[in-house]
Interface confidence: low
């Protein structure tokens, strides 16, 4: 990534895991310090500062030369940090839900999860690995969206009603592929344009349910960095229980 | 794409003040934790730091320019702006406005994104 | 005020060469210190921040190292693409540059 390049955008779900992918290109003669390498990552918020900024993020820095130039800075604060001996620090108190995979370090993926993802975590992500003699560093925005699945009309449906669900996800692109199933029993059960089923963009169109129809539908939508994400709804058509 | 561009007169007159704007595109100069800085380059000279400022409008300046200097933030326009009074011929320079990333630090940092500078010259 | 030394001012070099460019500074500045490329006519780009830790995207053959007062810029195997001048920058007392290393063909 060149200075003043675009910083690579990762989209997450509210609620889902979310994996802030930094894998970057160690010399071959680096490869034997993975074992002892170390990685910080700090997060820039999009919206307000950090509720609090630990001491050890403020000793990290050098000293200024006068009170004046303090200013209000940073908003940006550690995230974790871990040591060569895989001592974890950041900011406080450490949340579990803050991740990363011991053995992806060793492999030289030094990946932050957050399971799950918050509004709250929007923002730019930069991350440097310490080798012994030198430093890599990976930057990136995480935007997060929320998904959701929406009938039209809502609520219950009796026995040869219409309905129009509709898949979405807060993104402004559009998603490059949208695929429609079931769940049953079974597992999944893609949904296929028929009579019975009228698949338009993220909406597909059922013009006379069915108790057969009672359950969850789920729709998964993918766009063109490779971001996918998983939606269920469940319908109510009422009358005869369908056979389990 | 962040982008910096550098706007002003080209020729100042000596004794008189150079004016600089900086107009940032690609990011809100409010909505980040960055500074925003000034660096001047005398024709086959180095680098020189005038002083940078937040988009709160707190600034920190160059000691030896500080009393000539006065650095001003628009969020609103999403620029900043230089002002440097009493000018003479050792002004003359290449002006470049440049976001100071803080990384790892929590006070000063390097210039990560830079505009492609504009010539300022002084002679009456 | 805190005064950044480079040396050599210029530098002689061929293609495949281990090019290294000194920086000193007057006084202690931790692991504060940055190194930039700059090319005729252009902004100067950084390269290293933190003493060692390379900007994204900069190739490795770039390495800073040192600490306290005494630091290097290493350029494994010069590259076409890296005649060019290199600058020191301090960042632990306000700011303050290098005077400059001319990287040429010999």
């Known amino acids: 990534l060149q200075p003043g390049a675009e910083v690579p955008v990762v989209w997450a779900q509210e609620g889902a895991p979310a994996q802030l992918p930094c894998s970057p290109t160690i010399p071959l003669q680096d490869l034997s310090l993975l074992r002892r390498a170390g990685v910080t990552w700090q997060h820039q918020p999009d919206s307000g500062p950090p509720a609090s900024i630990p001491a050890l993020d403020l000793l990290q820095g050098p000293h200024p030369a006068a009170p004046s130039s303090w200013g209000p800075r940073p908003r940006r604060y550690t995230v974790l940090s871990v040591g060569p001996g895989g001592l974890r620090s950041g900011r406080l108190p450490l949340q579990p839900r803050v991740q990363l995979d011991e053995r992806g370090r060793q492999r030289g993926d030094f990946s932050l999860w957050l399971r799950p993802a918050r509004r709250a975590d929007a923002g730019e992500y930069r991350a440097a690995v310490h080798l012994r003699d030198r430093a890599l560093s990976c930057r990136l925005r995480l935007r997060l969206g929320q998904a959701s699945m929406t009938a039209s009309p809502p609520g219950s449906l009796r026995a040869s009603d219409w309905v129009i669900l509709n898949c979405s996800f807060s993104r402004p692109d559009r998603p490059a592929s949208v695929h429609w199933f079931r769940n049953r029993g079974q597992g999944r059960v893609p949904v296929r344009e028929s009579p019975h089923h009228h698949l338009a963009e993220s909406f597909l169109f059922l013009p006379q349910v069915s108790p057969m129809d009672s359950g969850p539908w789920g729709c998964i939508l993918t766009y063109r960095d490779g971001f996918n994400v998983s939606i269920m709804y469940n319908l109510t058509v009422l009358g005869l229980e369908p056979p389990t | 794409q962040l982008q910096l561009q550098e706007s002003g007169p080209g020729l100042v007159k000596p004794s008189e003040t150079l004016s600089l704007t900086c107009t940032v595109s690609?990011?809100?100069?409010?909505?980040?934790?960055?500074?925003w800085g000034w660096i001047r380059q005398p024709p086959g000279k180095g680098l020189e730091w005038i002083g940078s400022i937040f988009y709160s409008g707190n600034t920190y300046y160059n000691p030896s320019l500080k009393s000539r200097v006065t650095i001003s933030v628009d969020t609103s326009k999403n620029q900043f702006s230089l002002k440097l009074s009493s000018v003479t011929a050792a002004d003359t320079a290449v002006y470049y406005c440049?976001?100071?990333?803080?990384?790892?630090?929590?006070?000063?940092?390097?210039?990560?994104?830079w505009g492609q500078g504009t010539m300022v010259t002084v002679s009456s | 005020d805190i005064q950044m030394t480079q040396s050599p001012s210029t530098l002689s070099a061929s293609v495949g060469d281990r090019v290294t460019i000194t920086c000193r500074a007057s006084q202690s500045i931790s692991s504060w210190l940055a190194w930039y490329q700059q090319k005729p006519g252009k902004a100067p780009k950084l390269l290293i921040y933190?003493?060692?830790s390379s900007e994204s995207g900069v190739p490795s053959r770039f390495s800073g190292s040192g600490s306290g007062t005494e630091f290097t810029l290493t350029i494994s195997s010069l590259q076409p693409d890296d005649f060019a001048t290199y600058y020191c920058q301090q960042y632990n007392s306000y700011l303050t540059f290098g005077g400059g290393t001319k990287v040429e063909i010999k």
């Open positions: 933190k003493a060692s």
């Open positions: 690609g990011d809100s100069i409010s909505s980040s934790s960055y500074y």
């Open positions: 440049a976001r100071e990333d803080d990384f790892l630090t929590d006070y000063y940092g390097a210039f990560d994104i």
